[in-house]
C-alpha cells in the first residue's frame, strides 16, 4: 500500500523520492506523475528529468533538492484539495526490469482557521522521533510518511532552513533511497 503524506490547503506539499547515482553526475531519467505507477513511464506526467537536467515540468511542481545528487523529491506549491491522490515517482534504471517505482498518497486537509502556534525552532524537540527513522539500506528505507501526526510541509520548510546542517542531511536521507551501481 502507498505511504501517506499530508499537507494543508495553501501550503507546499513534499513527496520524498531519492536514489544514489552510481557516480556524480551519472543520472538516470526520473518521472513524476499523478496516478499510480503504470507499466512504464508515469501517468499524467507533471515533471521529468533526463540524464542531465529537468526537461519537463508543469506549474507548481518542482524539485527543491539537488536532483544531481539523486534527490528527486517533489514539491507541489500552494496545494488545493484537488491535489489529493496518488503520485508516482519512477526511477528509470537501465537494465532488465530494474525500474524503481514508488506510489505516494497525498492527503490534503482544509486549512486550519485557528492561527498556528509559533513554530518550534529546535528540530529534535519539534520532531523527537525523526532521527530514529534513518535508513541506509540499498533498497527502500523508512519514510517520513509512516510517522503519524507530522506536518510534512513544516518538515520540508525546516529542511530548507537547515539545508547545510547535519539535521537536513538526516531528513534528506530518510526518504525512499535507491543506490545504483
Amino acid at each position: 500500500s502507498e505511504v501517506e503524506y499530508r499537507a494543508e490547503v495553501g501550503q507546499n506539499a513534499y513527496l520524498p523520492c531519492f536514489y544514489t547515482p552510481a557516480a556524480p553526475g551519472n543520472l538516470v531519467p526520473v518521472c513524476w506523475g499523478k496516478g499510480a505507477c503504470p507499466v512504464f513511464e508515469c501517468g499524467n506526467v507533471v515533471l521529468r528529468t533526463d540524464e542531465r537536467d529537468v526537461n519537463y515540468w508543469t506549474s507548481r511542481y518542482w524539485l527543491n533538492g539537488d536532483f544531481r545528487k539523486g534527490d528527486v523529491s517533489l514539491t507541489i506549491e500552494n496545494v488545493t484539495l484537488a491535489d489529493s491522490g496518488i503520485y508516482c515517482c519512477r526511477i528509470q534504471i537501465p537494465g532488465i526490469m530494474n525500474d524503481e517505482k514508488f506510489n505516494l498518497k497525498l492527503v490534503i486537509k482544509p486549512a486550519k482557521v485557528t492561527p498556528a502556534p509559533t513554530r518550534q525552532r529546535d528540530f529534535t524537540a519539534a520532531f523527537p522521533r525523526m532521527l530514529t527513522t534513518r535508513g541506509h539500506g540499498p533498497a527502500e528505507t523508512q519514510t517520513l510518511g509512516s510517522l503519524p501526526d507530522i506536518n510534512l510541509t513544516q518538515i520540508s520548510t525546516l529542511a530548507n532552513e537547515l539545508r547545510d546542517s547535519r539535521l537536513a542531511n538526516d531528513l534528506r536521507d530518510s526518504g525512499a533511497t535507491i543506490r545504483i551501481g
Epitope: A36, I96, N98
Partner: antibody, heavy 120, light 107 residues
Framework: QVQLQESGPGLVKPSQTLSLTCTVS??????????WSWTRQHPGMGLEWIGY???????YYTPSLKSRLTISVDTSKNQFSLKLSSVTAADTAVYYC????????????WGQGTLVTVSS | EIVLTQSPATLSLSPGERATLSCRAS??????LAWYQQKPGQAPRLLIY???NRATGIPARFSGSGSGTDFTLTISSLEPEDFAVYYC?????????FGGGTKVEIK
Amino acid sequence: QVQLQESGPGLVKPSQTLSLTCTVSGGSISSGGYYWSWTRQHPGMGLEWIGYISYSGSIYYTPSLKSRLTISVDTSKNQFSLKLSSVTAADTAVYYCASLDSWGSNRDYWGQGTLVTVSS
Amino acid sequence: EIVLTQSPATLSLSPGERATLSCRASQSVSSYLAWYQQKPGQAPRLLIYDASNRATGIPARFSGSGSGTDFTLTISSLEPEDFAVYYCQQRSNWPLTFGGGTKVEIK
C-alpha cells in the same frame, strides 16, 4: 514520422533461436521519448505483448518468455532486435515491432509485421 | 496477470449505427487502458489511451470511457472502414495484456 520495418527469417527450426530486427527510419532510436517494443499474434488469435526496451535502457520482458528472450538496441544501425531461444511450434506467429511515444502515450507506430513459422 | 474480458465477441451492425464495445478487467487498472483497431493483414492501430483520450489522428466518432475495471469503446456512427477487430489493452500492471477482441462485422 517514425516508420518501422521488421526483418528476419520466416522459417525457424524447433530448438533454434528466432532472431528478428526492426529498422527505424524517420527518427533516431537513441533520442529520448520512445519505448521500442515487440508484440506477437498467433495465427487467428489475439495479441501478446513480448517486451520493450526504453530510451533510457530499461528493459521489460513478459514473464512467460523471460527465460528465452533478449531485446537489445543497436544505435549505430538505428535498429532494435528480438532473440527468442529454444523455439517450438507454439512460437509460430506474426511478430510486430512498435514504438510508443512516452510523452503521454498519445501515438504509437507499428511495423507491418512478419510471419515466423517454427517447423522442421 | 490481469485478464481482460471483451464482450461481445462479435457485433453485427450496419453502417451509421452506434457500436458499444465492453472491456472488463479482472482487477483495477485505474485509467491505464488503451483500445486498438486491427484490420486483416494489418498491424494494430491505437485509438484510445488512458481510457478516454483519443490518439493522434483518430476521428471524433471514437470515444472511450470507464475506469477501474469496466471500460467502454463507443463508435457513434459506424463508417465502412470501421468494420474490424477491436482490442483493449491494460498498461497498469506488468505484463501488459490484451483482451480477446471484439469483431465488428457488417450486418
